[in-house]
């Protein structure tokens, strides 16, 4: 039956995807399990097969429709169950009544590009992907720049407290290779979390002009 040691966490990408992770101590490796979604006010049900991501952890994506379709709203509640096969039946291993817009995690920003680069500055833009129109401008971003000889974890976080899909990086070193990443988060939702980081964008600052003091 539903086990107290299991953890079942899901996030909605604000459009047509609910991603879930289920972890359980001592769960059988060879058991077939799935997540079943039953919305309270919609005519569709959806399932996805849980696939192992570690020794005692499984994940799957509920695809609710076309990527940019708005399949759920702020008033929807979706009953999510982890079901594992036992013989010819499916046992309920975990259950939650899921409020999509309280549990948001957007897709990573895409289409990062260098708009303009100089010796000490670089202007970068990006786009958000599959984000609901409900947010209007109620989004925030975090960005980080990887400098030579450092790790991503050491990179200071730059916070953009509004829907601003560009940044001007300053005080850069001339003729130096950098990488840049950005992530996004809606302001809405008690359990909302940051999107994954974008794919890194590599860029190089221009060399200082010869004979000029830098």
């Amino acid at each position: 039956a539903v086990n107290g040691t299991s953890q079942f966490t899901c996030f909605y990408n604000s459009r047509a995807n609910i991603s879930c992770v289920w972890s359980q101590d001592g769960a059988l490796q060879d058991t077939s399990c799935q997540v079943h979604a039953w919305p309270d006010r919609r005519r569709w049900n959806q399932t996805c097969e849980l696939l192992p991501v570690s020794q005692a952890s499984w994940a799957c994506n509920l695809i609710l429709g076309a990527p940019d379709s708005q399949k759920l709203t702020t008033v929807d509640i979706v009953t999510l169950r982890v079901l594992c096969r036992e013989g010819v039946r499916w046992r309920v291993m975990a259950i939650q009544d899921f409020k999509p817009f309280e549990n948001l995690r957007l897709m990573a920003p895409i289409s990062l590009q260098v708009v303009h680069v100089e010796t000490h500055r670089c202007n970068i833009s990006w786009e958000i992907s599959q984000a609901s129109h409900y947010f209007e401008r109620h989004l925030e971003f975090e960005a980080r720049t990887l400098s030579p000889g450092h790790t991503w974890e050491e990179a200071p976080l730059l916070t953009l407290k509004q829907k601003q899909e560009w940044i001007c990086l300053e005080t850069l070193t001339p003729d130096t290779q950098y990488e840049f990443q950005v992530r996004v988060k809606p302001l809405q939702g008690e359990f909302t979390t940051w999107s994954p980081w974008s794919q890194p964008l590599a860029f190089r600052t221009k060399p200082a002009a010869l004979g000029k003091d830098t």
């Epitope: 039956a1 539903v2 169950r81 039946r89 499916w90 259950i95 939650q96």
Partner: nanobody
């Protein structure tokens, strides 16, 4: 086959209170989740409140702070205490139980709650 029998409901004035109860014919201690749904005339069914086997509770935003769900496993009963009722709470309320197995979904017969002066 588990039977769910509902009690309560009826006509109440705005601002008033009402308690619905749902009694199961068998033990509810192994029910993975008990819930109350409602459907107003011409509207979609909606989840009002739910409570899992482990006591996790969820409320629709429209009733949060006014309604309270509880379950008494010793009496095989789930309750919905409804306070500060509004005309928009008028609907048929149905009790729902989800069992240990995926095919175990049980419904009460439904009871009409009318909030009107």
């Amino acid at each position: 086959q588990v039977q769910l029998q509902q009690f309560g409901g009826g006509l109440v004035q705005p601002g008033g209170s009402l308690t619905l109860s749902c009694v199961a014919s068998e033990s509810i201690s192994e029910m993975s989740r008990m819930a109350w749904y409602r459907q107003a005339p011409g509207k979609q069914r909606e989840l009002v409140a739910s409570i899992t086997m482990h006591g996790g509770v969820v409320y629709a935003d429209a009733v949060k702070g006014r309604f309270t769900i509880s379950r008494d496993n010793t009496k095989n009963t789930v309750y919905l205490q409804m306070n500060s009722l509004k005309p928009e709470d008028t609907a048929v309320y149905r009790c729902n139980a989800l069992g240990t197995w995926s095919d175990e979904t049980y419904w009460g017969q439904g009871t009409l709650v009318t909030v009107s002066s």
